[in-house]
């Protein structure tokens, strides 16, 4: 069952998701100046079964000008640098790691992929958050959020963290040190 | 809470054009497609086409190009949907919808008549 | 364009029952099918998507199944709130398309 909106935002922070959930589709976007082909999914879908998922439907993207030509993707991961801070880079080297029964791992990138992936989580999928570079974590509690269905809506749990620039106070009173991410948190995709 | 919405109702004369909005509200606007439908009574549900407010890309289905004009004000969230050269043909319930069909507007009734 | 066939206009049932209805793509969709329902005077809702996956909120006796040309809403346990028309749409390939729709009729 898809959510029926988007994670909770935080200031100065990025979302990702360790694996995602059957069911959850990752919308196919372009950068500027190319177009989702004419036909095809307009997204990839995490299916399969409890042994095995993977992510049906390919994105593929294609020259605006040249509205006739359609170009057969090959994955280039080069095409990711635009994407990702090498922080993030070896975060996933660490989901790649990851295989959970009913989850997909991160698929790779498309040619001429947009610069923000666009994902339709369903209930149940957590997401962990990451203050973004030059910003520190605060902690209350887990900088994570979860999709959870009550009384037939859906609805994301707020994530405990606040991310503060590194010339503030970096901790709340009596705290410890916070960490800038939770221990061992193998991120994904960037999604915000 | 995702809502679309378009106001209930246009009494257009023929010839003429008419524009209709779709307010979106509850989700990043620039960050999916809004399509447009159009329903008439013994003609089914019919797909007009999509923009994406993000990249300003759209697509049109053939049969109403020259029609239709799709556009999108990312500033205030809201798609708009230009049918021109209006005629009985036309009148008929419009629904915008986003996020891969999984939301629908109410629906906006255009009513073609002298 | 791909034509979406609900060869069915109409479907009787009791409430309790399980029915189905069917729509045939005119060529191959892959799973890119979703299903509507229609209840008088509302707009669409969402059901189906990617040919078996539910939407949130939609009750689980609503199923889906099929690909390639042949898809399938199976409803168990009918309920009198299910009265209405059900749309399949494709979206594999630009433009998109609808069946013609089937209206359910509960006896």
């Known amino acids: 069952e898809l959510c029926d909106d988007d994670p909770p935002k935080i200031t100065h922070a990025t979302f990702k998701a360790v694996a995602y959930k059957e069911g959850t589709m990752l919308n196919c976007e372009c950068k500027r100046g190319f177009r989702r082909i004419k036909s095809g999914s307009p997204y990839m879908l995490c299916t399969g079964n409890s042994s095995h998922s993977s992510w049906d439907n390919q994105c593929q993207c294609t020259s605006s000008a040249a509205r006739n030509t359609t170009k057969q993707v090959t994955p280039q991961p080069e095409e990711q640098k635009e994407r990702k801070t090498t922080e993030m880079q070896s975060q996933m080297q660490l989901a790649d790691q990851v295989s959970l029964p009913g989850h997909c791992r991160e698929p790779p990138p498309w040619e001429n992929e947009a610069t923000e992936r666009i994902y339709h989580f369903v209930v149940g999928q957590t997401v962990y958050y990451q203050c973004v570079q030059g910003y520190r974590a605060l902690h209350r509690g887990p900088a994570e959020s979860v999709c959870k269905m009550t009384h037939g809506k859906t609805r994301w749990t707020q994530p405990q963290l606040i991310c503060t620039g590194e010339t503030e106070p970096s901790q709340f009173p009596g705290e410890e040190e916070p960490q800038a991410s939770p221990d061992g948190l193998p991120e994904s995709e960037t999604s915000r | 809470q995702v809502q679309l919405q378009q106001p209930g109702a246009e009494l257009v004369r023929p010839g003429t054009s008419v524009k209709m909005s779709c307010k979106a509200a509850?989700?990043?606007?620039?960050?999916?497609?809004i399509g447009w439908v159009k329903q008439r009574p013994g003609h089914g549900l019919e797909w007009i086409g999509d923009?994406?407010?993000?990249?300003?890309?759209?697509n049109y289905n053939e049969k109403f190009k020259g029609k239709a004009t799709l556009t999108a004000d990312t500033s205030s969230s809201t798609a708009y949907m230009n049918l021109s050269s209006l005629t009985s043909e036309d009148s008929a319930i419009y629904y915008c919808?986003?996020?891969?069909?999984?939301?629908w507007g109410q629906g906006t009734l255009v009513t073609v008549s002298a | 364009d791909v034509v979406m066939t609900q060869t069915q206009k109409f479907t009787s049932t009791s409430v309790g029952d399980r029915v189905s209805v069917t729509c045939k793509a005119s060529q191959n969709v892959g799973t890119n099918v979703a299903w509507y329902q229609q209840k008088p005077g509302q707009s669409p809702k969402a059901l189906i998507y990617?040919?078996?996956y539910r939407y949130s909120g939609v009750p689980d006796r609503f199923t889906g199944s099929g690909s390639g040309t042949d898809f399938t809403l199976t409803i168990s346990n009918v309920q009198s709130e299910d009265l209405a028309e059900y749309f399949c749409q494709q979206y594999n390939s630009y433009p998109y398309t609808f069946g013609g729709g089937t209206k359910l009729e509960i006896k």
């Open positions: 923009i994406h407010p993000g990249g300003d890309y759209s």
């Open positions: 990617s040919a078996s």
């Open positions: 919808t986003s996020r891969n069909f999984a939301y």
């Open positions: 509850g989700y990043t606007f620039t960050n999916y497609w």
